[in-house]
C-alpha cells in the first residue's frame, strides 16, 4: 500500500528538489526560501525570484521552506529545571538542557524535567549518569537499592523486595526479637 501524501507534499513532489509548486499556478515552480527566512510572496513567474524575508527576533526556520510565518522560538521550562544551552537564532531553535550532574527525565516526547544524578552513597557507581539516564548504583553489603539510593537493611521490612538482599540482617532482627521472649 502506498501511503497517502498530504496536499502540500503532493504539490511539492511535482517540482524538483528545492522548489515548490505555485499555489495559484501549478505550472510554476518557485524556489524555496533558505533557512532563517520565510515566504513573503510567491515567485511571479518561472525563473523569477521568490520573495523571502528574514525571520524576526524571537522566531526561526531551521530548514528550507515555503512557510508564510517563521516558527516561534521555544522557551526553556524553568519550572522543570531546564537551562538554556544555546539561544534561538533565525535558523535554529533554542536548545534547552540540564545543569552539570543532572539528567533528563522525559514526561512526553518534547517535555523533560531535570533531576540530580544519584551519588551512590553507601554503594558504587555501576553505570555513570548519562544525558537521559540516572546513575546506576550497586549497593555495599548491608544496604539495598530503593529509588536508586542505597538504604540501610535496618529499614527493610519483611513485606518488601529487599528481604532477599537483606536476608542475613532480617534473620538477625528476627532472632533478636525471638530471644526477647522467655
Amino acid at each position: 500500500l502506498v501511503p497517502h501524501l498530504g496536499d502540500r507534499e503532493k504539490r511539492d513532489s511535482v517540482c524538483p528538489q528545492g522548489k515548490y509548486i505555485h499555489p495559484q499556478n501549478n505550472s510554476i515552480c518557485c524556489t524555496k526560501c533558505h533557512k532563517g527566512t520565510y515566504l513573503y510572496n510567491d515567485c511571479p513567474g518561472p525563473g523569477q525570484d521568490t520573495d523571502c524575508r528574514e525571520c524576526e527576533s524571537g522566531s526561526f526556520t531551521a530548514s528550507e521552506n515555503h512557510l508564510r510565518h517563521c516558527l516561534s522560538c521555544s522557551k526553556c521550562r524553568k519550572e522543570m529545571g531546564q537551562v538554556e544551552i544555546s539561544s534561538c537564532t533565525v535558523d535554529r531553535d533554542t536548545v534547552c538542557g540540564c545543569r552539570k550532574n543532572q539528567y533528563r527525565h522525559y514526561w512526553s516526547e518534547n517535555l523533560f524535567q531535570c533531576f540530580n544524578c544519584s551519588l551512590c552513597l553507601n554503594g558504587t557507581v555501576h553505570l555513570s549518569c548519562q544525558e537521559k539516564q540516572n546513575t546506576v548504583c550497586t549497593c555495599h553489603a548491608g544496604f539495598f537499592l530503593r529509588e536508586n539510593e542505597c538504604v540501610s537493611c535496618s529499614n527493610c521490612k519483611k513485606s518488601l523486595e529487599c528481604t532477599k538482599l537483606c536476608l542475613p540482617q532480617i534473620e538477625n532482627v528476627k532472632g533478636t526479637e525471638d530471644s526477647g521472649t522467655t
Epitope: 527525565h105 514526561w107 524535567q113 533531576f115 529509588e147
Partner: nanobody
Framework: EVQLLESGGGLVQPGGSLRLSCAAS????????MGWVRQAPGKGLEWVSF????????YYADSVKGRFTISRDNSKNTLYLQMNSLRAEDTAVYYC?????????????WGQGTLVTVSS
C-alpha cells in the same frame, strides 16, 4: 477500553485537606506515567503534578509545591493526589490523565474529573 475514574473531590475550607483518587482500567497501568491536571472556572488547563511509572520521578507545579503529594499504587491501578493547606485558588475540576494523552481534549480521553471547591 481505557477508563479513568476520579473521586475524592468536595467542598473544603481554606487550610483543609483532601485526597483525590483515580481508578484506572483498560490499560497496563504500571507501564505508564500519570498526571493530575486541573481546570479552574473560566480558565485553561494547568498541569498540577506528574509521576513516572514506578514512582521514582515526580513533578509539581510551583503553585502546589510543598502542599500537594502525588503517589500511585500499581497493585491497585490507582493514582492519588494528597492536597494539604488548600487555598481558594485551588478550586477547580481535577482530572487524571495518562501522560501520552496530555495534549488530547480532556473530555474525550480523560475521566469526568472531580470538583474541588475551597471556600469558607
Amino acid at each position: 477500553e481505557v477508563q479513568l475514574l476520579e473521586s475524592g473531590g468536595g467542598l473544603v475550607q481554606p487550610g483543609g485537606s483532601l485526597r483525590l483518587s483515580c481508578a484506572a482500567s483498560g490499560f497496563t497501568f504500571d507501564k505508564y506515567q500519570m498526571g493530575w491536571v486541573r481546570q479552574a472556572p473560566g480558565k485553561g488547563l494547568e498541569w498540577v503534578s506528574f509521576i513516572d511509572s514506578n514512582g521514582h520521578h515526580t513533578y509539581y507545579a510551583d503553585s502546589v509545591k510543598g502542599r500537594f503529594t502525588i503517589s500511585r499504587d500499581n497493585s491497585k491501578n490507582t493514582l492519588y493526589l494528597q492536597m494539604n493547606s488548600l487555598r481558594a485558588e485551588d478550586t477547580a475540576v481535577y482530572y487524571c490523565a495518562e501522560l501520552d494523552n496530555l495534549s488530547i481534549t480532556p473530555f474525550d480521553y480523560w475521566g469526568q474529573g472531580t470538583l474541588v471547591t475551597v471556600s469558607s
